[in-house]
């Protein structure tokens, strides 16, 4: 997270760290008791890694009583996701057992309706990505709110060109902006999840290059369908 | 697929008012910049400006700015161009285009005369 | 505002010819964010320009390997490899880095 603060300890419940082989690989969002959402990007070049999920989690490093790290099931990315488009970046993950939930653990509601959020409204996005340019990993959770971009904005020639479909979304990157190791995690308006960091190589912190969010009410019914 | 048609064209008096529609279909409306760019007979292209079909937002060439006004209607997925104090010298076949990717999405062109 | 200037206005070639064609722009177009945002169209009589290169060298989709652009800062080129009979038409150089955007004038290709 460029530009933004470090988090409330344990104030977003629903985040997650999606790891390889013990290192934080991007950001992760629990949907339900066994399923956390992040980016199908991220698991690309995991082939032979161990993958797991950390809940519960503050600090990457520390000791916390609400930390706990599980294995993951099954991976379930997005079918239509290829290596070389942001188009649908989604990846489900399923825990080897249903987390254990409490005041630091706890799924976030997703948006199921599909229209866009309102151009300006802030929303929060949070991860353990990058904080500046020189590429430093933070060890606590980081946050940022940021507002929503029009995706006519988005699509100018001198922003992301024409590649903004209707199932994705943008906001505003001024300084402030999602950046490397953030993918996955959640872009959360009003307390509901609207969206899911991409996981592109995008340059972060310029105005004129947004943040790319995949719109998870465009993806409702694959979720319900990989839930059920 | 994406479509740009113009309407509106035609003969007009100096002096006149012509307001050209620019209907799209194939695409969500509202995602897309519209620009308008026109071509005087056997003359080059000139850029008369954009709109943001979210805001509303307007961008105009300089040249333009006092005579011209672009309008929106999202519900029939329509953008405008509202042409007054028309002259001769804007006799041109008149374009919209979608910026996204660069103008890779035209009208055909619909052509106006100013003449008496 | 920016000019952009192309050479020649006009040029007679043949099939099978290599044809270049020059853009200068009065100033810099590279744009804040560090792109450079110039682009080719191509213009037949009677219709609608269609899109060749953007962001100088690209290829937009379904443009023929044939058409080609380089350069960089104010000097800029569309190259057509081996001219078919298709090719001849109307091409302009473009700047989307500094509004207001503009146009070259147009290089006309005509057949020899």
């Known amino acids: 997270i460029l530009g933004g603060r470090e988090a409330e300890a344990h104030a977003r419940p629903y985040m997650a760290s999606v790891q390889l082989n013990g290192a934080h690989l991007c950001g992760g969002v629990l949907v339900a008791e066994q399923w956390v959402l992040s980016a199908a990007h991220c698991l690309e070049d995991a082939a032979d890694g161990k993958v797991q999920v950390l809940l519960g989690a503050h600090s990457l490093s520390q000791p916390e009583p609400s930390k706990r790290l599980y294995d993951v099931l099954r991976a379930v990315p997005h079918p239509d996701s290829q290596p070389d488009t942001i188009d649908h970046d989604l990846l489900l993950l399923q825990l080897s057992e249903k987390a254990t939930l409490g005041p630091a653990v706890r799924p976030l509601p997703w948006q199921r309706v599909d229209r866009d959020v309102a151009p300006g409204t802030l929303c929060d996005v949070a991860g353990w990505g990058i904080v500046n340019h020189a590429g430093r990993r933070p060890d606590s959770l980081q946050h940022v709110l940021l507002p929503v971009l029009d995706r006519a904005t988005c699509n100018r020639r001198t922003h992301h060109d024409g590649a903004i479909t209707e199932r994705l979304m943008c906001a505003e990157s001024n300084r402030r902006d999602s950046c490397k190791g953030d993918s996955g995690g959640p872009l959360v308006c009003g307390g509901v999840l609207e969206g899911v960091v991409t996981s592109g190589s995008r340059v972060c912190g310029n105005r004129k290059k947004p943040g790319i969010y995949t719109r998870v009410a465009s993806y409702a019914a694959w979720i319900d369908s990989v839930l059920a | 697929e994406v479509q740009l048609v113009e309407s509106g064209g035609g003969l007009v008096q100096p002096g006149g008012s012509l307001r050209l529609s620019c209907a799209a279909s194939g695409y969500q409306f509202t995602s897309y910049y519209m620009n308008w760019v026109r071509q005087a007979p056997g003359k080059g292209l000139e850029w008369i400006g954009d709109?943001?079909?979210?805001?509303?937002?307007?961008d105009y060439n300089a040249d333009f700015k006092r005579r011209f006004t672009f309008s929106l209607d999202t519900s029939k997925s329509t953008a405008y161009l509202q042409m007054n104090s028309l002259r001769a010298e804007d006799t041109a076949v008149y374009y919209c285009?979608?910026?996204?990717?660069?103008?890779?999405?035209w009208g055909q062109g619909t052509l106006v005369t100013v003449s008496s | 505002d920016i000019q952009l200037t192309q050479s020649p206005s006009s040029l007679s070639a043949s099939v099978g010819d290599r044809v270049t064609i020059t853009c200068r722009s009065s100033q810099t177009i590279v744009h804040s964010n560090g792109d450079t945002y110039l682009e080719w169209y191509q213009q037949k009589p009677g219709k609608a320009p269609n899109l060749l290169i953007y962001?100088?060298?690209n290829r937009f989709s379904g443009v023929p390997s044939r058409f080609s652009g380089s350069g960089s800062g104010t000097d800029f080129t569309l190259t057509i490899s081996s001219l078919q009979p298709e090719d001849f038409a109307t091409y302009y150089c473009f700047q989307g880095s500094h509004v207001p955007v503009t146009f070259g004038q147009g290089t006309k290709v005509e057949i020899k």
């Open positions: 962001k100088v060298s």
């Open positions: 709109i943001n079909p979210v805001t509303g937002d307007t």
């Open positions: 285009t979608r910026e996204g990717p660069s103008f890779a999405y």
